[in-house]
Every structure is written in C-alpha cells, then in structure tokens.
Interface confidence: low
C-alpha cells in the first residue's frame, strides 16, 4: 500500500501508474467502493457525484498519455485521511492518505518568557513523530505535542515542523511572533540638572495596554510608583504621575519618558511593566546621576545610582593628571586650584559620564 502525507488546507497527489505507459481506462474509488472519478475510454474525466460534492477532486489530464492517472485532492480536510483505490488494467492499487495539521497553542503572538506549544493533529492509526526547527536552528523533537519554554526574542520568525511517518515527511511552517522590549535594560548617565530620556521600543506595534514605572531611589529602601499610563490605539495617555518630577511621556509609540531635570535624589533603578492582553512585559531602567560642587574649601564629585564595582570616579583639572581617582561614589579635592575641573565616571577606558565646574577662587561656594 502506498502512503501519501498531506497538509490540511493544501493539495495532495495520489499516484496511480499504468505498466503500459499509455492512456487507459481507470477509476478512483473510496474504500467503501463509492466512485470518485475516472476515464472510461473517451479521454473525458467523469466524476462520480455532483460537482458540489466532488469539486475538490481532480486528475492531471496531461499525465494520462504517459500512463499516469493521479487523484488530486484540493483543500484537504482531516477527514480525507483514508484509503483510496485506483482500478486499472484489471488490478487495484490502494493508496493511504494521511492528512496532518500543526497548530500553535492559543496564539502565534507570545510574550518573551512564555511557552510555545505546538500540537500535531493526526488521523487514527497514524504514529507520527514531529521535529520542529526554530528560526535560529533550535531543534525540538517529540510525539504529537511539543513545548518550548522561556521563548526569547530571537525565537520570532518561521518555525518549521517536519512530521515523519513511515519514512515519509511533510513540512509545516508556522509564523511565531515573540513580543518583547528590544533591550533587556536601559541605563542613563546624567549630570545633575540635565534632562534624561528613556525610550522603550517594542518589536511590535501594540494597540492597547497599560503600564507603570516603579522606582527605587538609591537612598530609599522601597519602590514607589513614578508614572502610570495607558496605550489605546497606539496613543499613550498618562494616568498618574509623581508631581515633583514633572515627568513627560510622549503621546505616541515608542514609549518615551523624559525627566526634565535630574538630581541625585532621583538616582536609582526602576521597573517598567507593560500589561497587554497576553500578559506582562518587564523592562529594567537605571539612572546614574553625577553632581560636582564646590563648598567652602572643598571640591566634591558625587555619583548616585546603580554603578558597577569596576567603575572609577576621577576628579582632575582639565588637561592635567588625575588628582583623585577612586573606585567609589564620592571623591573630593581640598583647596582646589582655580580653573576648569572635570569629574569622570569611567569603566575601563570607556567614559560613562563627564561633568565640569569652573573653580573661581578657593573658599567660594558653588554648585
């Protein structure tokens, strides 16, 4: 018995060959002997029932002269899975058709971190194995249900699932979109008084949802809400905002948050949550603030916010050797010389932040 694998919604070609390689009488039947179609000697295709009942069934007239009499079944349904009989030259050829379907759980748009389940629907009597390959080449194998946990942004794209049955295979392509922020964490390095802008681009255009930025200043031991907002038809509206910050949220996507003037007290870390119909996305936000000030006879450079232990704070007169350089968050120079001083926050040879101050004369207070 010949086996043919098909995909729901597509077409299958069931073979039937004559040994004489020429046109001959043939008939295709269901296993219950109901006639589907055939050719009875006049080169005309005769259908076994009404056109509406048999319009999905066809043959390839062009192949008849070569002794080939295939049965074409279009718009395949799961219930087309059965045995078909081709009668020609006083013999019967049996062809088994199995129609398969692969579907993704609930939706093909999933959030980063969620699980993807691919399910194979198969006809009774079949014993398929499934192997699915992600856009990145990741291979997963199994029976009729396959699961991938902790989806990553890079899992977006076309997943190719190969159904294997009796050494034959059929391929399915499923487009999966992993919804995510385009970066895992954002850090802004700013001098006191500057404005800070955070942009949160998504890898998709989300129509509706709501979000909140919870913030924990370095000096605080708890998170507090800074701003809450909603997204409707790609428009962003502020619901609540901390008044003393004068936060500005752009009205259009991508989500863009601006702090007009940062100060040391704002430095810290935040967590932006965006709640959509499908679940919640998280984005880490960090703000590092630098302040250089001269008070009495001392020049101080201070940094607050989440810095790494490898970061170095350097206070020096411009175009001169470093006066103070420490792996800590505050550096001071007593009785600084008059002139332009700069404070640098660096990691290795990469400068993260640079703030300058003009020292006019010793003992003058200025910030």
């Amino acid at each position: 018995k010949t086996l043919v694998l098909g995909k729901e919604g597509e077409s299958a070609e069931l073979p039937c060959e004559s040994s004489q390689k020429k046109i001959t009488v043939f008939t295709w039947k269901f296993s219950d002997q109901r006639k589907i179609l055939g050719q009875h000697g006049k080169g005309v295709l005769i259908r076994g029932g009404s056109p509406s009942q048999f319009d999905r069934f066809d043959s390839k007239k062009g192949a008849w002269e070569k002794g080939s009499f295939p049965l074409i079944i279009n718009k395949l349904k799961m219930e087309d899975s059965q045995t078909y009989i081709c009668e020609l030259e006083n013999r019967k050829e049996e062809v088994e058709l199995w129609v398969f379907k692969v579907t993704a759980n609930s939706d093909t748009h999933l959030l980063q971190g969620q699980s993807l389940t691919l399910t194979l629907e198969s006809p009774p009597g079949s014993s398929p194995s499934v192997q699915c390959r992600s856009p990145r080449g990741k291979n997963i194998q199994g029976g009729k249900t396959l699961s991938v946990s902790q989806l990553e942004l890079q899992d977006s794209g076309t997943w190719t699932c190969t159904v294997l049955q009796n050494q034959k295979k059929v391929e399915f392509k499923i487009d999966i979109v992993v919804l995510a922020f385009q970066s895992t964490a954002i850090t802004a390095y700013k001098s006191e008084g500057e404005s800070a802008e955070f942009s949160f681009p998504l890898n998709f255009a989300e129509e509706n949802g709501w979000g909140e930025l919870m913030w924990k200043a370095e000096k605080d031991s708890f998170f507090q809400p800074w701003i809450s907002f909603s997204i409707k038809n790609k428009e962003v509206s502020v619901q609540k905002s901390t008044k003393d910050l004068k936060l500005q949220l752009k009205e259009t996507l991508p989500l863009t948050l601006k702090i007009p003037q940062v100060s040391l007290q704002f430095a810290g870390s935040g967590n932006l949550t965006l709640t959509l119909d499908k679940g919640t996305l998280h984005q880490e936000v960090n703000l590092v603030v630098m302040k250089v000030a001269q008070l009495n006879n001392t020049l101080t450079c201070e940094v607050m916010g989440p810095t790494s232990p490898k970061m170095r704070l350097t206070l020096k007169q411009e175009n001169q050797e470093a006066r103070v350089s420490e792996e800590q968050k505050v550096v001071q120079v007593v009785a600084p010389e008059t002139g332009l001083w700069q404070c640098l926050l660096s990691e290795g040879d990469k400068v993260k932040m640079d703030s300058r101050i003009q020292v006019l004369s010793r003992g003058v207070n200025q910030t």
Partner: antibody
C-alpha cells in the same frame, strides 16, 4: 573592544579528545548566542555548533553529533567545545564566533559578525 | 541541507576595476544570506548580511544584492587590500552552510 580568543587546540591521535575554550571580553557575553565554525586546511567553512545565550538551546551539524558537546559558562565569559572520538576529518582551524542581530522596520536580522582568530586542531596518528 | 554554489571559483581583476561575484542557493534562503572575506591566516570578516546590508566598518565600494536563490557581491573599484577569498553563507536553515569560495586575484 570586543574580543574572542580561542585556545585548547593541538595534535591528537584518532579516537582522542580535546576541549576547546573561547574567552570573550568587551561585551556582555550572556546576551549573545555563540557558535563554533571550522575550516579544514585549504578548504571552505563548516558550521559545527551553536548555543543560545542561556545555554538551553544547542545544535550540532550531523557529522559531529554524539561526539562533540558545546557548553558555556556565562559567569566566566567562556564558551567550550568538548571533542571526543576525534577523526582525521576533524582536522581544522576552529573559530569561535558571536551571533549578532539588528532590527529594521520591526524585523530582526541575524548574522555572525565577530570571530576569534581560531585555534588549530590536528588529528593524526 | 541547502547547497551554496559560488561562481567563478577564481577571478582575476585589475586594481580600480569592478568585480562581480555570484552565489546560488539550492533552495530559497529569502534574505538570510551573508558574504565574508577571508585573507590567508586570518578569520573570515563579515562584509554583508541580510543579503544587502553592509556590516559596520565595511567600505561603500562593497555592495550586495539578490534574494531567494540568486545573490551577487559587487566591489565597485578594487583596492589592493580587497584581493582575498570570498564566501557566501546562508543562515535560513540549519545546518547553516557556506559556498566553496571565490578567490579574487590581482590581474
């Protein structure tokens, strides 16, 4: 700057084992998918294996399946390739490479942009 | 496995002239396609990804085109440092595969 440095290559007899290492620096190693690619003397390039950023997703080319094992230690910024049951046809320069991605009009494009200088593996009796 | 076929195997061109290298995939790879340059004793260097996007730091004289199964790398005005072996690469299906290489020589 971004750097990948392979080590662990050498001369080994057929059936022997070697463990290649790749030390990464200048970038957040745990954010990137990593790969091993090889090049036999005077020949073209062949993809050997890749591993996801988390280390959960691993794939090998057919010729090394069951013999080679790719792994990573994100805490130590290191990528490894354990090669067992080595054959003469495994003789090659082995490159460690980082897979990058860029986005354009909401689509993501992947490419292997950063390569190490390579380490030579010779399998001979 | 997708087979990548490069032509010609070798190409002799004078400095300042244009060079055109071709690559054909045995099946569609869409735009998941790259070109690499390799000099003796060195690792491959990415020139083009996504079929036509120049990698960071690659001069504008290098350009890629094509989609599906037919791809072209054009070097508009050859410099002495451009003489090397060029590989095409598909990353649509695993295993990722390379062409056999085209050696670009000084005429």
């Amino acid at each position: 700057q971004v750097q990948l440095v392979e080590s662990g290559g050498g001369l080994v007899k057929p059936g022997g084992s070697l463990r290649l290492s790749c030390a990464a620096s200048g970038f957040t190693f745990s954010d990137y998918y990593m790969n091993w690619i090889r090049q036999a003397p005077g020949k073209g390039l062949e993809w050997v294996s890749y591993i996801s950023s988390s280390g959960k997703t691993i794939f090998y080319t057919d010729s090394v399946k069951g013999r080679f094992t790719i792994s990573r230690d994100n805490a130590k910024n290191s990528l490894f390739l354990q090669m067992n049951s080595l054959r003469a046809e495994d003789t090659a320069v082995y490159y460690c490479a980082r897979e990058d991605y860029s986005n354009y009009e909401d689509y993501y494009y992947y490419y292997t942009g950063v390569w190490g200088k390579g380490t030579t593996v010779t399998v001979s009796s | 496995e997708i087979v990548m076929t490069q032509s010609p195997a070798a190409l002799s061109v004078s400095p300042g002239e244009r060079a055109t290298l071709s690559c054909r995939a045995s099946q569609s790879v869409s735009s998941k396609f790259a070109w690499y340059q390799q000099k003796p004793g060195q690792a491959p260097r990415l020139l083009i990804y996504n079929a036509s996007t120049r990698a960071t730091g690659i001069p504008a004289r290098f350009s890629g085109s094509g989609s599906g199964t037919e791809f072209t790398l054009t070097i508009s005005s050859l410099q002495s440092e451009d003489f090397a072996v060029y590989y095409c690469h598909q990353y649509k299906n695993w295993p990722y595969t390379f062409g056999q290489g085209t050696k670009l020589e000084i005429k």
